[in-house]
Interface confidence: low
């Protein structure tokens, strides 16, 4: 560790005095002190002499000697006071910049240690300190404002009592900066823009930060645009806004626009795309299949995506039949806007009734014209079955009619005993009818099929059952011959109530 001579922590001299400070170390040594005039430096191997033959108040300060080669990095210091009755303060810096909650050192050094008892810190023009300003004083270093706040960004002066009057230092501007959490916050509006050639457009790029020192620019594709900047300060944030106004857009204005802001913490950028089109457009689409099948009693949401510019002038859902002239209830139709030019329209059809099958059309209009998108809704029904005994061409025949959607398949069963439904143990014979006759098959309606089972002799202690099934469910009808004719049993439960 180097040694300073004179071997005292403080040295007090009068202006004009000669001062010599000598530092000795094991190796080469260096001096560090306040920037001030009239010092001369002599170095001789492991010693260094700092001297002046005309000390002034500006030489007041702490002089530190270090030995760069010392692995312990030790240093020695001496504080020099040059006590000038006319100049009680030596101000080392007129501007101090700190971040909020740091300690701010205002470096006004007292030139005479005797004056320490009468020092105070004030704001310029004699104004008192702001309330809650917590500060301390060191004659070596000056005033420290502890945990400085943004509001304490002021011009300060150090005051000393000399002969009963207050003598002020030159002012020190304290700038307390907000702690910058990161690059400036950015907004670029709109997020997307579409215009028809010849229309006007505006793109606004704005950046804000707690600190004024940041840059913002707007670029089109990769070209920086020269746009005047408007600046403001509100909500404790600095704001810089660039507004691009285009009176009549053309295709060369289209493309990617990026708003870029940067500060010491880094850079933020956000982009938007500007489309210029020749004329108005209106496109309808759906992620759903336009042909829908739903089981009766269930619900369905029909969704249409609309891409349009300019905005829609009208839209509605229409039921096109074939069952009734009812129209969808407006409360079941709902619109959501995904963004400026894309919307989703939903028609909710809860607990579908047979009369609600058919075509549903979404119509929309803008200056580009009308567009429609039509859904076809077919309802699925479980089969309904009925059996009758009849004679066809002189032969006794069981006739089974099954109605449902999708088209039902038909199976005949013959089983022993009288029963409402054949179970496996009773089954004597099974006939599948792979191609029942289709009696009716209209769009949006049930399909009705007919199956014939020719029976030469009806066995009286047996049951004949017609079963029909499709993807929705199944139905059956049991036919029980009795001596006085035939007895029929529909299923125990009525499978379907619309």
């Amino acid at each position: 560790i180097p040694v300073i001579e004179p071997s005292v922590p403080e040295l007090v001299v009068k202006p004009g005095a000669t001062v010599t400070l000598r530092c000795v170390g094991n190796g080469s040594v260096e001096w560090d002190g306040p920037p001030s005039p009239h010092w001369t430096l002599y170095s001789d191997g492991s010693s260094s002499i700092l001297s002046t033959n005309n000390a002034t108040f500006q030489n007041t300060g702490t002089y530190r000697c270090t030995e760069p080669g010392d692995p312990l990095g030790g240093s020695a210091a001496i504080h020099l006071y040059v006590k000038d009755p006319a100049r009680p303060w030596n101000v080392l810096a007129q501007e101090v910049v700190v971040f909020e909650d740091q300690d701010a050192l205002l470096p006004c050094l007292l030139t005479d240690p005797v004056l320490e008892a009468g020092v105070s810190l004030v704001r310029v023009r004699g104004r008192p300190l702001m309330r809650h300003t917590n500060y301390s004083f060191s004659p070596w270093h000056g005033f420290t404002i502890h945990r400085a706040k943004f509001i304490q960004s002021q011009d300060y002066q150090c005051s000393a009592l000399m002969g009963g009057r207050k003598v002020m230092s030159i002012s020190i501007r304290l700038k307390v900066q907000k702690v910058i959490p990161g690059p400036p916050a950015l907004t670029l509006v709109p997020a997307e823009l579409v215009r028809i050639r010849g229309e006007a457009a505006q793109i606004v790029c704005s950046a804000s930060s707690v600190d004024v020192n940041f840059d913002v620019f707007l670029q089109h594709n990769n070209t920086k645009l020269a746009i005047p900047q408007q600046s403001d300060f509100h909500n404790n944030r600095y704001q810089k806004v660039l507004t691009l106004n285009l009176d009549q857009v053309d295709f060369q204005h289209a493309g990617n626009y990026s708003c870029v802001a940067s500060n010491v913490q880094g850079k933020h950028s956000t982009s938007m795309f500007f489309r210029v089109v020749e004329s108005a457009y209106l496109n309808l689409s759906s992620e759903q299949n336009l042909i829908q099948e739903v089981t009766v009693g269930e619900g369905l949401n029909l969704k249409v995506m609309v891409e349009a510019y300019p905005g829609l002038q009208g839209f509605n859902w229409t039921y096109l039949g074939p069952f009734s002239d009812h129209q969808p209830e407006p409360k079941l139709a709902n619109a959501t806007t995904k963004d400026t030019y894309r919307h989703t329209f939903t028609l909710s059809l809860p607990r579908l009734k047979p009369s609600e099958a058919g075509r549903y059309s979404f119509l929309a209009r803008n200056p580009g014209g009308w567009r429609a998108l039509t859904f076809e809704l077919t309802l699925r029904y479980p089969p309904e079955v009925s059996v009758i005994w009849t004679f066809i061409n002189g032969s006794g025949t069981l006739l089974c009619a099954a109605s449902g959607y999708p088209q039902p398949n038909v199976t005949w069963l013959q089983c022993s005993g009288h029963t409402d439904r054949c179970d496996e143990a009773q089954v004597l014979q099974v006939w599948d009818d792979p191609y029942p006759e289709v009696l009716s098959q209209e769009p949006f309606h049930k399909v009705t099929v007919q199956s014939l089972l020719t029976v030469e002799t009806l066995e009286h202690n047996q049951t004949y059952e017609c079963r029909a099934h499709n993807s929705v469910g199944s139905g059956s009808w049991a036919f029980i011959p009795i001596s006085a004719g035939a007895h029929t049993h529909p299923p125990d439960e009525f499978l379907f109530t619309p």
């Epitope: 501007r173 005047p228 408007q230 507004t243």
Partner: antibody, heavy 118, light 107 residues
Framework: EVKLEESGGGLVQPGGSMKLSCAAS????????MDWVRQSPEMGLEWVAE??????????FYAESVKGRFTISRDDSKSSVYLQMNSLRPEDTGIYYC?????????WGQGTTLTVSS | DIQMTQSPASLSVSVGETVTITCRAS??????LAWYQQKQGKSPQLLVH???NLADGVPSRFSGSGSGTQYSLKINSLQSEDFGSYYC?????????FGGGTKLEIK
């Protein structure tokens, strides 16, 4: 409350000099851009000069009619802006306003009158 | 330099009427325009900035519009306190020129 107070106006002969001062309060003066604007019945409102903040290197700008004759300056420690006017002409007669620039000329002083006449 | 042409130079109207003052710039000023109101013997006061934005405390009967080179200031349902002179001024670089003014007088 923002306050701007001009002083230094009066009667001066053609070819003479005059220095106008403007004392500001109620805002962070060092961050502000300050301008001088004058008004006369003949010329209406006429922008004269501008000085920007330290962050903008205290850049100065002048109207063509005063370039080389007028000098704008500021003393942030005194929250004051000045207009040194030399080689004055009769057409420089008017009310001189000190203004603060923010989104426009947001704040104006009450004005000080300069008369250039023999 | 950009020239600002304001019209009309004067206007004589009654309380309750609506008036429009226009300002034309010699080149595109991209909405960097301010309007000021000045009453007799007083300093000008900022009314509108950036062509369309009302300054703090300005009544909503005042409105600014325009873009490019054409701008206007509209006053709906004139009140007695609205009489005075109105000036436009551009902020598109320097020099910051003013319009010639419009004097609004009571009929």
């Amino acid at each position: 409350e923002v306050k701007l107070e001009e002083s230094g106006g009066g009667l001066v002969q053609p070819g003479g000099s005059m220095k106008l001062s403007c004392a500001a309060s109620g805002f962070t003066f060092s961050d502000a851009w300050m301008d001088w604007v004058r008004q006369s019945p003949e010329m209406g409102l006429e922008w004269v000069a501008e000085i920007r903040s330290k962050a903008n290197n205290h850049a100065t700008f002048y109207a063509e009619s005063v370039k080389g004759r007028f000098t704008i300056s500021r003393d942030d420690s005194k929250s004051s802006v000045y207009l040194q006017m030399n080689s004055l002409r009769p057409e420089d007669t008017g009310i001189y306003y000190c203004t603060r620039v923010k989104v426009g000329f947001d704040n104006w002083g009450q004005g000080t009158t300069l008369t250039v006449s023999s | 330099d950009i020239q600002m042409t304001q019209s009309p130079a004067s206007l004589s109207v009654s309380v309750g009427e609506t008036v429009t003052i226009t300002c034309r710039a010699s080149e595109n000023i991209y909405s960097n325009l301010a309007w000021y109101q000045q009453k007799q013997g007083k300093s000008p006061q900022l009314l509108v900035h950036a062509a369309t934005n009302l300054a703090d405390g300005v009544p909503s009967r005042f409105s600014g519009s325009g873009s490019g080179t054409q701008y206007s200031l509209k006053i709906n349902s004139l009140q007695s306190e609205d009489f005075g002179s109105y000036y436009c001024q551009h902020f598109w670089g320097t020099p910051r020129t003013f319009g010639g003014g419009t004097k609004l007088e009571i009929k």
